[in-house]
């Protein structure tokens, strides 16, 4: 796949000129070289105080690290100079230029195995395996709701083209080691797992190597279980009324549920002058429950049109789901059509009708 | 709750440059990558590019790489995207969007920044 | 790049119906397609990713299948708050494309 970006392998002590603001020059040195960067002023005009940054923080100078307006020089350099290097503008902290550099175990040049000196600062990728996109490297614990689908990947190039391997916990890692088997795409240097559960849990590895080198990045994968629960239906809902003979009237109820949900709505009723049973469940009756053609945006609404006296009680909003069940209630009070309203229940709204 | 609060509309001149930011919160700024898209009025959207927060390190499209500059301020969770040298071309309404790290997709958005360059 | 084409540019469709809206990519994009709902003023809302695992808290109403390089979305039992503009996303590289987008509107 086209990264759009531009690698190079830099041989010792090559200094390589900054590239375009916005863009990220990939570097790659062997260790024990000079790293050397170049940042010349935009369109050649003044470049003003500049600061040097290394992941984010500030170089300071030392017998190693050499700091110029323009140039930084790391001499012999280790895998801990990898990193991301830009020069900005100290005021503004503007980059003015970005590098991705990578330090490879072997010398950029001398003894390869066919003899061949690899060219120094010629654009062309030879060599040792090294991260094209290093910017996406360093996230390492992926923490993962489960049921989702998870992607690792490690972006590499080198010459001649690197193989890719993975493992698990050390160990070789193969599509008959988990039910729903893997994926593996060389081209995108991905590893994919469908529909993760927590048995997936633990630390993927990437190798990635030729036969100049060899390069690794792990990763910890956590599966987070969803706990399942009972339907939540929010505060508040629904709310208490107060409605004048003969208006609408409308209560809402509003759930949240993993599982389908069913919903009732119910209102409370006297039987023999009781409200509740001898077991003490209470006598309700069923508004409204699901049906074929029922949606659940149409069961968090209850609507009574044309209130009468008989109407006026407790309405209860009845959700569960294979967990368990959850409700709430609120009461509607029906006021005589003459009366003027003044004031509603605090709780309530007024429908005139 | 993850949000991605954007700054306010921008009416610049052309040849100008416009800064405008996405304030993260509702989650750990540092490990998620912040994508940039653009959407030119009655058009799809158009993907520029994203910055790891952690580290700096970008990834452009192309076709933006001369155009946008994309920064963050760690201290403050908030990601920037510079846009220069600005034409009627780039009139359109700009969004931030979060990387969801385990696959790659876009998960959360901001509520865009409209910007109009007109003389 | 990959393109992604996307169809129909617009449709009307009646409360409680179905509506079925299709990407095509110009390579296999290995079901890493999503699918977002944009309304006028807000950030694209993500209803589904990885072809057909839906998001949180996004109702079962909203579906997606495909493989390969054809993928499709759809909505039934359409409610009014459904108008909105539909786009893909296909997210398989390190270069994201969408597509042209899908306006939905209600007959």
């Known amino acids: 796949e086209s990264l759009g970006t531009e690698q190079r392998v830099v041989g010792r002590a090559a200094e390589v000129p900054g590239p375009e603001p916005g863009q990220q020059e990939q570097l790659v040195f062997g260790s024990g070289d000079a790293v050397e960067l170049s940042c010349p002023p935009p369109g050649g005009g003044p470049m003003g105080p500049t600061v040097w940054v290394k992941d984010g923080t500030g170089l300071v100078p030392s017998e190693r690290v050499l700091v110029g307006p323009q140039r930084l020089q790391v001499l012999n350099a280790s895998h801990e100079d990898s990193g991301a290097y830009s020069c900005r503008q100290r005021l503004t902290q503007r980059v003015l230029c970005h590098f991705s550099v990578r330090v490879t175990d072997a010398p950029s040049s001398g003894d390869d195995e066919d003899g061949e000196d690899e060219a120094e600062d010629t654009g062309v990728d030879t060599g040792a395996p090294y991260w094209t996109r290093p910017e996406r490297m360093d996230k390492k614990l992926l923490a993962v709701p489960a049921a989702n689908t998870v992607r690792f990947r490690c972006p590499a190039a080198g010459n001649p083209t690197p193989s890719i391997s993975w493992l698990k916990n050390g160990r070789e890692f193969r599509g008959e080691h988990r039910i729903g088997g893997i994926k593996l795409r060389h081209q995108q240097w991905s590893l994919v797992m469908e529909s993760v559960v927590p048995s997936d849990r633990g630390n993927y590895t990437c190798v990635v190597e030729n036969k100049f080198g060899s390069i690794r990045q792990t990763y910890t994968l956590d599966v987070l279980e969803r706990s399942p629960h009972r339907p939540i239906l929010q505060a508040g809902l629904p709310a208490n009324q107060t409605a004048v003979l003969g208006s609408d009237v409308e209560f809402h109820c509003k759930v949240y549920s993993d599982a389908q949900p069913h919903i009732q709505w119910l209102k409370h009723v006297e039987v023999n002058g009781s409200k509740v049973g001898p077991d003490g469940t209470p006598y309700v009756t069923v508004l409204k429950t699901a049906g074929a053609n029922t949606t659940d945006k149409e069961l968090e609404v209850l609507s009574l049109h044309n209130v009468t006296f008989e109407d006026a009680g407790e309405y209860t909003c009845l959700a569960g789901n294979s967990i368990g069940f959850s409700h709430h209630s609120a009461w509607l009070v029906v006021l005589p059509a003459e009366e003027e309203l003044v004031e509603a229940d605090e709780a309530g709204s007024v429908y005139a009708g | 709750e993850v949000q991605l609060q954007q700054s306010g509309p921008e009416l610049v001149k052309p040849g100008a440059s416009v800064k405008m930011s996405c304030k993260a919160s509702g989650y750990t700024f540092t490990d998620y990558n912040m994508h940039w898209v653009k959407q030119s009025h009655g058009k799809s959207l158009q993907w520029i590019g994203y910055?790891?927060?952690?580290?700096?390190?970008?990834n452009y499209n192309q076709n933006f790489k001369d155009k946008a500059t994309l920064t963050v301020n760690k201290s403050s969770t908030t990601a920037y995207m510079e846009l220069r040298s600005l034409t009627s071309e780039d009139s359109a309404v700009y969004y931030c969007a979060r990387e969801r790290d385990y696959d790659g997709s876009m998960d959360f958005w901001g509520q865009g920044t409209s910007v109009t360059v007109s003389s | 790049d990959i393109q992604m084409t996307q169809s129909p540019s617009s449709l009307s469709a009646s409360l409680g119906g179905k509506v079925t809206i299709t990407c095509k990519a110009s390579?296999?994009?290995?079901?890493?397609i999503a699918w977002y709902q944009h309304k006028p003023g807000k950030g694209p809302r993500l209803l589904i990713h990885y072809t057909s695992t839906l998001q949180p808290g996004i109702p079962s109403r909203f579906s997606g299948s495909g493989s390969g390089r054809d993928y499709s979305f759809s909505i039934s039992n359409l409610e009014p708050e459904d108008i909105a503009t539909y786009y893909c996303l296909q997210y398989d590289n390190l270069l994201w494309t969408f597509g042209g987008g899908t306006k939905l509107e209600i007959k």
């Open positions: 910055i790891n927060p952690n580290n700096g390190g970008t």
């Open positions: 390579q296999d994009i290995n079901k890493f």
